[in-house]
Interface confidence: low
């Protein structure tokens, strides 16, 4: 796994200062020229021995992460993240200082690369036994250890076959993407292959670890295999999804498809450095690779994110929680996992494509053709993960071409309103997996306009908060999204219920596990709602019969979610009026025993409306939908009684899930609605209209 | 079903050649990496020879190497063991097996095995 | 041909746990190459029980777990059960030999 072997070198402090000064000015020249460490080294040195070095910011603890998949780790080099707003002399010091305190101690440290442009921080080579010293240094946030990551394609056929032609019911234009410009991070690639040729810009960056061992002698067609086939998927003339669009390719993977996440980590700051120094139209970064969780590649995937660039990453091969790896991780990259033609997950061997919360939506993945770096005309079908990244990214540039002034926000709602909804076998995934993984195949929009009017939401699950009594869960949308409502799900039933929060001046959603519950999820419904301000409206317990209420007030203001929120473990089975007062849609009701929380916005021309569907009999599920050219905004449930496991939105239906209560044969406890509230934007239609 | 079945196997006289053949059904033979392993009676497993899905990669144990030849027909979803100058230590069962594919995370683990093919040097 | 160094046997009574030890050097286990841990019933091919050190095979147990520090892997079996009575082996990819590495194997006995 070409682990970097660290070695600790014994050299006491009288007998390294004797060296240096025994090498003199010309020497200490030679040595500065070499590492750049020579005069920091002795000061620091000096002022460590006065008693004079620096202590980290008081009441800050640094922490140390590594990769929780054993194999995969990369002991010996390390990442060491400093605070936000560390300056890059600062960032240089804090390097130069630990390896003056490391040679104190008798260890040598190599300084391999100084961040600087997305995170401030610097790659170290070192021994372990010096992470508690560096943890300890001035400006550290956290370190974290080197890890592999890894191609996420398989090449199933190697036979040369001829691609075939797109269908002509697909929205196919020649030109498709041209505004745009691709980066992809993969292996090497054969630039000269003609459906790529002219199209891609093969970058002057390169970092990539060893082979493993000697059995794989470099072969250019096999170094070149996976980066070729995916800029082929990306752009290229016959099998090309944006065949319009520009490449630069980033050697970040070597010719076993195998990278670190330093080395990653350095490819993403070539980009915002390119970035900065001739901008360009809108950018989209494909990363078809994965390695295991890792903190400070999701934070160098947020910050270029938040500078505009559009990542699209593959989901993983690895038949498990997307959340479990990165970049996959990172809630603002667009997580791609893969189907087939039958729109099936797809298996890869005894594994397959990874599934959750963490994926934003799937795209064909299985026995894909494209370019063969066997030679300049050959073909080749390869699967994974990959390739549906491929997809969608070439999906993104058509979209972004077409209106080039999408945000990350808009571009991923996009992705999600025009995918195939429910067309995936849900039975593929684990059991607890199927309600959070995205049932969801990109496609490309039936026009490249017209999408305008339309008011956009989609759901955001939380991570599981644990089966402590005191658990919560929280869900956020991303930062140019509004949360118009909140919900809550748990299977075992066990929870308290839900509530909007402010958090850091944006609104999460927050969801309370119960007393001997398993744990919640909590759901957030984020949607793109311009010039809109948002507020939450509370109603505490009422203890009433007819039980608690709270409407929107202020004027002009609608109602798009309702949530509630108890303190005692169990609402028991009083049950308020399934059907509200007439006149009152602005108006959520709940137990008596629970406060009630109304999501109010005022936003131009926002109007919304209250739907329900009441069963009276027991029954595990209750669904209510949006019409046409209406967006579900609020999902929830009445009663909020202790046999309902949750509400949460899918697409534009609100689903209501019960315990089964049949063997109970209480048909009182068995009665429940969902509440749909379903909202649209007339002023978003009539911009549209005047537009065209 | 993905199977992989063993052949060729025999009795041998010392200083001569046996051909050992393995066909492969059920999945898609060109895209995996191919193996030979043996395993002497009452003995351990010991690697022998493996060769990449488009015949780029071959390696030997060292214990064999200039001895036996491994090759590969996609076309025919077959491995191959040539094995020339047979000594009495060559006695084994020899299996054949499919290596996970090459951008595995996990590569050089060995998940279909056939059920093997007797080979037995001896005058 | 060098081979990375199991126990010869290990026993246990039903329900205990077992930890079998696969011992090899920097050029395979501890040069951060992959190992694989491999079950044999008398008579039968070799399965793969679990690869790259943790990755359990579908259909496998979760009795059966694998771990790996520095030059050693190493496999457990918790809750040992009369059917894991077999032969283990390990093995790597060595980059001295540019090629598979198998360990001498593990007899299993269940009492």
């Known amino acids: 796994m070409g682990t970097v072997s660290s070695r600790r070198s014994w050299w006491p402090l009288p007998l390294l200062l004797l060296l240096l000064l025994l090498l003199g000015p010309a020497g200490a020249r030679a040595q500065e020229d070499e590492d750049g460490d020579y005069e920091e080294l002795v000061l620091a040195l000096r002022s460590e021995e006065d008693g004079l070095a620096e202590a980290p910011e008081h009441g800050t603890t640094a922490t140390f992460h590594r990769c929780a998949k054993d194999p995969w780790r990369l002991p010996g080099t390390y990442v060491v993240v400093l605070k936000e707003e560390t300056h890059l002399s600062q960032s240089e010091r804090t390097a130069r200082r630990l390896q003056a305190q490391a040679a104190r101690r008798g260890y040598l440290t190599k300084i391999l690369h100084v961040f600087h442009g997305l995170l401030p921080g610097f790659l170290v080579k070192m021994s372990g036994d010096l992470l508690e010293l560096a943890l300890k240094l001035p400006h550290v946030d956290y370190i974290e250890e080197d890890s592999s990551v890894f191609a996420q394609s398989i090449p199933w056929n190697l036979e040369r076959i001829t691609p075939p032609r797109y269908r002509a019911d697909e929205y196919q234009p020649p030109d498709g993407g041209s505004l745009v410009e691709v980066y992809l991070l993969d292996t090497s690639i054969q630039s000269d292959h003609r459906e790529i040729e002219g199209r891609v810009m093969v970058t002057d960056f390169e970092n990539v670890p060893e082979e493993d061992g000697t059995r794989f002698h470099r072969q250019a067609s096999k170094c070149d295999s996976h980066g070729t086939h995916l800029a082929g998927v990306v752009s290229g003339r016959d099998a090309g999804v944006a065949k319009g669009a520009s490449m630069r390719s980033l050697r970040v993977l070597n010719c076993q498809g195998k990278g670190t996440v330093s080395g990653t980590l350095i490819g993403l700051e070539f980009i915002r450095k390119s970035q900065l120094v001739q901008p360009v139209g809108p950018l989209v970064v494909l990363l078809p690779l994965a390695g295991g969780y890792s903190r400070v590649l999701n934070a160098a995937c947020q910050r270029l994110a938040r500078a505009g660039v559009v990542l699209v990453t593959a989901a993983g091969n690895f038949r498990d929680d997307a959340c479990l790896y990165s970049p996959a991780s990172a809630p603002e990259v667009i997580t791609v996992g893969a189907t087939n033609a039958q729109d099936q997950p797809v298996t890869l061997g005894t594994l397959g494509t990874n599934f959750g919360r963490c994926v934003d939506l799937f795209a064909p993945g299985e026995d894909i053709i494209g370019a063969s770096s066997d030679c300049s005309t050959c073909f080749v079908s390869q699967s994974g993960t990959s390739q549906a990244a491929a997809h969608v990214a070439g999906i993104a540039a058509m979209m972004l071409s077409a209106e080039p002034e999408l945000t990350l926000a808009e571009l991923r709602q996009r992705l999600i309103h025009f995918s195939a909804k429910d067309v995936i076998n849900e039975a593929w995934f684990p059991e607890d997996q199927r309600v959070l993984t995205p049932n969801l195949v990109a496609a490309l929009p039936p026009s490249t306009h017209g999408a305008g009017w339309q008011l956009f939401c989609r759901t955001v699950w939380s991570a599981h908060s644990g089966p402590t009594r005191m658990a919560t869960a929280v869900a956020r949308c991303a930062p140019d999204e509004e949360l118009l409502s909140c919900s809550s799900f748990s299977r075992s039933g066990k929870r308290r219920g839900e509530r909007m929060e402010a958090q850091g001046g944006k609104l999460v959603c927050r969801a309370h596990n119960a007393f001997g519950g398993e744990g919640v999820y909590a759901i957030a419904r984020c949607c793109l709602l311009p010039q809109a301000n948002c507020s939450v409206h509370t109603a505490p317990p009422a203890e009433a019969s007819m039980g608690t209420r709270v409407h929107c007030h202020q004027q002009g203001h609608v109602l798009t979610g309702c949530s509630s929120h108890w303190e005692v473990e169990d609402l028991g089975t009083h049950k308020p009026p399934v059907l509200r007062p007439r006149g009152q849609p602005n108006q959520c009701v709940g137990h008596r025993e629970a406060s009630i929380h109304a999501s109010c916005c005022h936003a131009p021309g926002l109007e919304c409306k209250v739907k329900e569907h009441g069963i009276p009999a027991p029954q595990e599920q209750v669904t209510v939908a949006c019409e046409e050219g209406w967006t579900l905004t609020g999902c929830s449930a009445l009663p909020g009684t202790s046999h309902v496991l949750g509400a949460y939105a899918v697409d534009n239906t609100c689903v209501v899930r019960s315990r089964d209560v049949s063997t109970t044969g209480s048909t009182s406890e068995g009665a429940v609605t969902a509440v749909a509230i379903c909202c649209r934007s007339r002023h978003l239609a009539q911009a549209s209209q005047e537009l065209q | 079903e993905v199977q992989l079945v063993e052949s060729g196997g025999g009795l041998v006289q010392p200083g001569r050649s046996l051909r050992l053949s393995c066909a492969a059904s059920?999945?898609?033979?060109?895209?995996?990496?191919m193996n030979w392993v043996r395993q002497a009676p009452g003995k351990g497993l010991e690697w022998v020879s493996g060769i990449s899905s488009s015949s780029s990669y071959i390696s030997y144990a060292d214990s064999v190497q200039g001895r036996f030849t491994i090759s590969r027909d996609n076309g025919k979803n077959s491995l191959y063991l040539q094995m020339n100058s047979l000594r009495a230590e060559d006695t084994a069962l020899y299996f054949c097996a499919r290596e996970y594919d090459f951008w595995s995370a996990y590569y050089d683990a060995f998940d279909v095995w056939g059920q093997g093919t007797m080979v037995t040097v001896s005058s | 041909q060098s081979e990375l160094t199991q126990p010869r046997s290990v026993s246990g009574s039903p329900g205990q746990s077992v930890t079998i030890s696969c011992t090899g050097t920097?050029?395979?286990?501890?040069?951060?190459?992959?190992v694989h841990w491999y079950q044999q019933h008398p008579g039968k091919a070799p399965k793969l029980l679990i690869s790259g050190v943790i990755e359990r095979s579908s259909g496998v147990p979760d009795r059966f777990s694998g771990s790996k520090s520095g030059n050693t892997a190493s496999l457990t079996i918790s809750g040992l059960q009369a059917e894991d009575e077999a032969d283990y082996y390990c093995?790597?990819?060595?980059?001295?030999?540019?090629?598979?590495?198998f360990g001498t194997g593990t007899d299993v006995t269940v009492l």
């Open positions: 093995q790597s990819f060595d980059g001295s030999l540019s090629g598979s590495v």
């Open positions: 059920g999945f898609t033979f060109s895209s995996y990496s």
């Open positions: 920097s050029r395979n286990i501890g040069g951060g190459n992959d």
